[in-house]
């Protein structure tokens, strides 16, 4: 059985609920015959605030005046202490400290949609720390009133559950919220509004887009709205953009023509609605419609470059390369490229459609004047063709750019600089900087990269398809009319010492000297552009320093003579390779003994 307060009572004056800062009187009194047996005057009553003693008194009752109680609930417990026994709980009381409610602020009401219900929100002000009841009252024309109550401590929202109708859109309604607790009450300022002020339309729905004759220039957006909507705002953007285009329209009646959309672009569209020019609020944005605009024929022209390779006395190989159009130029999916090759004097022409590649290689006679035209086609048409006359790009020595250099510029960039050609520099119409990975075999399958530079530029930063620790063959062409001059250099963006030395594969004797042949270091072990090879030799079983011969690196070279060996002496030979960062480890060692006669 619970025996709380069987032995006595705790009373609280003026009230269990007090204003912050108030004083409270707590009295603990024993009921008759409930004190310590035989020693009633020895009764020791102790008052605890939670678990801390705050007062005690011998006798049948105890009075305590308490101040400075914090906001919230404080527990007081009265206990009786008798000699030679544990303290006995007599009774307890909770005191609730709080404040009167502040005036509710910023009362605002809204009805979501023409069929929605009126709901209001407000700011409660500071926490009262007490149970506080909120009453929301709405009064309208013809003395109509509605009332809703909220008994939640944290109440700042109530829905009346009634629907305002547009019969008299200018009729005034007044809302007011009142907060009441044990310490006082307070009412908000009244909020007066009309139907048009508080109805927030539902967002538009069923959004569609139509392109007349599959053309981006004839595009209409359609949607559905609530009946009283007067204004709409549209926003749209390419799906990959963060910036919206905005359009405000009046009396659109669920349709609007858009005139500035880009072709072959996925757009996101949203619409919002409002009932009145200057009253009320905009609806939420509608759900997004995503749609791709139709293709249009490509604009712009392809950037085309080429490479010539001598095959034999009568034939040459032409490799054409071109860059993809930008998305804004392609204006659709490029289906194929059309390449036309024409001999200008004889008028012969051949045309080929190329899909899936941005290059084309053919063999043509070395005689005649040849031209090519390349265009890109999508489902709507073709770009304007880029025309190029095939010429010997390096033929005009006086047009060759001078003092070409290539220097690493940060990660995976190479800065190429040059001086204008000696011949009248103003004759240069443009420079082309071309680069490709250096392969000792001169492999024509290696991808070609290029960029065009204006005639007044004397430098270019190349970064496309540049990898660390790879050597690139870089050419700078100066073009003038039907003439061209070029200069080349090797360059890398990052280098270190080669991982291995060349492999000597043969040593042969020729007229008292030897010819050393070697295999090139694999490209992936060169670690940048090679500058030199070194050939080392010393007498077998000798502790002397080896002699060495340093040879400048040339792509095609893989043999070199040495004529300083003594006959009938066995030598050990090996090779290393050097980049600007240092020397490789030894390649393989070979022994050789020259058989020739002694001098």
């Amino acid at each position: 059985k619970i025996d709380a307060c069987k032995r006595g009572d705790v009373t609280v004056k003026p009230s269990h609920v007090i204003l912050l800062g108030s004083t409270v009187n707590i009295t603990c009194s024993l009921k008759p015959r409930q004190g310590c047996f035989h020693y009633s005057r020895r009764n020791k009553l102790i008052l605890y605030k939670f678990d801390r003693r705050i007062n005690f008194h011998h006798g049948h009752s105890l009075n305590s005046q308490v101040t400075g109680l914090p906001l919230g609930t404080t527990l007081f417990v009265c206990k009786l202490a008798c000699i030679n026994s544990d303290e006995i709980q007599i009774c307890g009381a909770e005191i609730f400290v709080g404040v009167a409610p502040e005036q509710p602020q910023n009362l605002s009401c809204i009805q979501k949609g023409e069929q929605g219900t009126v709901a209001c929100t407000w700011e409660r002000g500071r926490d009262t720390h007490l149970y506080t009841e909120y009453t929301l009252q709405l009064s309208g024309p013809k003395n109509l009133t509605w009332q809703k109550q909220c008994k939640d401590i944290y109440c700042d929202y109530l829905d009346f559950g009634i629907n305002l109708t547009p019969e008299s859109p200018e009729s005034n309604f007044t809302a007011k919220v009142t907060a009441v607790n044990s310490l006082g009450s307070s009412s908000s300022l009244p909020s007066t509004f009309t139907f048009l002020d508080i109805v927030r339309p539902l967002p538009p729905w069923d959004i569609r887009i139509k392109f007349q004759k599959a053309s981006v220039s004839r595009c209409t957006l359609y949607w559905r709205d609530e009946g009283l909507v007067l204004l709409n705002r549209l926003r749209y953007r390419p799906s990959n953009s963060r910036l919206w285009n905005m359009v405000n329209v009046t009396k659109a009646k669920g349709r609007h023509d858009l005139l500035d959309l880009k072709p072959f672009t996925e757009y996101e569209f949203q619409i919002s609605s409002k009932l009145h020019l200057y009253k009320g609020s905009w609806s939420d944005w509608s759900e997004s419609l995503r749609a791709q605009t139709p293709e249009e024929e490509p604009t712009g022209m392809l950037d085309v470059w080429y490479m010539k390779r001598h095959i034999d006395y009568s034939r040459q190989q032409i490799s054409l390369f071109w860059k993809n159009l930008s998305v804004s130029e392609a204006r659709g999916k490029i289906l194929h490229y059309q390449v036309t090759l024409q001999e200008l004097t004889g008028g012969k022409a051949m045309t080929q459609n190329i899909t899936g590649h941005t290059s084309w290689t053919t063999v043509i006679p070395r005689t005649g004047n040849w031209a090519v035209a390349v265009s890109a086609a999508n489902s709507k048409g073709s770009s304007l063709p880029t025309r190029i006359n095939i010429m010997n790009l390096c033929e005009a020595g006086l047009l060759a750019p001078r003092q070409v250099s290539a220097n690493s510029e940060g990660m995976d960039n190479i800065l190429v600089t040059w001086q204008p050609p000696r011949k009248d520099p103003s004759a240069v119409q443009e420079y082309v900087v071309e680069w490709r990975e250096l392969h000792p075999g001169g492999d024509t399958q290696v991808p070609l990269n290029w960029l065009r530079s204006r005639p007044y530029n004397v430098s270019a930063l190349i970064s496309e398809n540049i990898k660390s620790y790879i050597c690139y063959e870089i050419r700078v062409y100066a073009l003038s009319g039907d003439q061209g001059g070029c200069s080349s250099i090797l360059g890398n963006s990052k280098h270190k010492a080669p991982l291995s030395g060349p492999h000597i594969n043969a040593i042969t004797e020729e007229k008292g000297s030897i010819l050393i042949s070697w295999n090139s270091i694999p490209v992936q072990e060169q670690m940048g552009c090679l500058l030199h090879y070194r050939i080392y030799w010393k007498e077998r079983d000798s502790n002397s320093q080896p002699q060495l011969c340093e040879i400048p690196y040339r792509v095609s070279q893989n043999s070199h003579p040495i004529n300083s060996l003594q006959p009938r002496v066995t030598y050990v030979l090996w090779m290393t390779a050097l980049t600007a960062a240092g020397e490789s480890s030894h390649g393989n060692e070979r022994e050789f003994c020259l058989q020739g006669k002694a001098n």
């Epitope: 269990h16 307890g92 909770e94 149970y131």
Partner: nanobody, 125 residues
Framework: QVQLQESGGGLVQTGGSLRLSCVAS????????MGWFRQPPGKEREVVAT????????YYADSVKGRFTISRDGAKNTLYLQMNSLKPEDTAVYYC??????????????????WGQGTQVTVSS
Amino acid sequence: QVQLQESGGGLVQTGGSLRLSCVASGRTFNWSAMGWFRQPPGKEREVVATISGGGTSAYYADSVKGRFTISRDGAKNTLYLQMNSLKPEDTAVYYCAADRVDYRMTLTQNGNHYWGQGTQVTVSS
């Protein structure tokens, strides 16, 4: 009128847990003691746990001490009983009760309280 509506009862194995809830409507019980009572089959109603209006003081019957926890949420006008390590002898109809008088610290066995309809808790072995 005042209503107390219990929920959360059910069938559970020995050693299992349940959480009972009691939602009060019709008046606020923020100042009133509330509690849980139970009536095992064929026995009298007995107190399980009570809690003061401000939630600062709780009482538990000896048979449930250390296993059951009573709590309340004034904002939601809701009383809870978390029951862990349930035993077959906890099988009973559990009733929610609220004091008709504000500011008292606890409910008494035979006091004049508001009562709920009860929710069945069955603990099977």
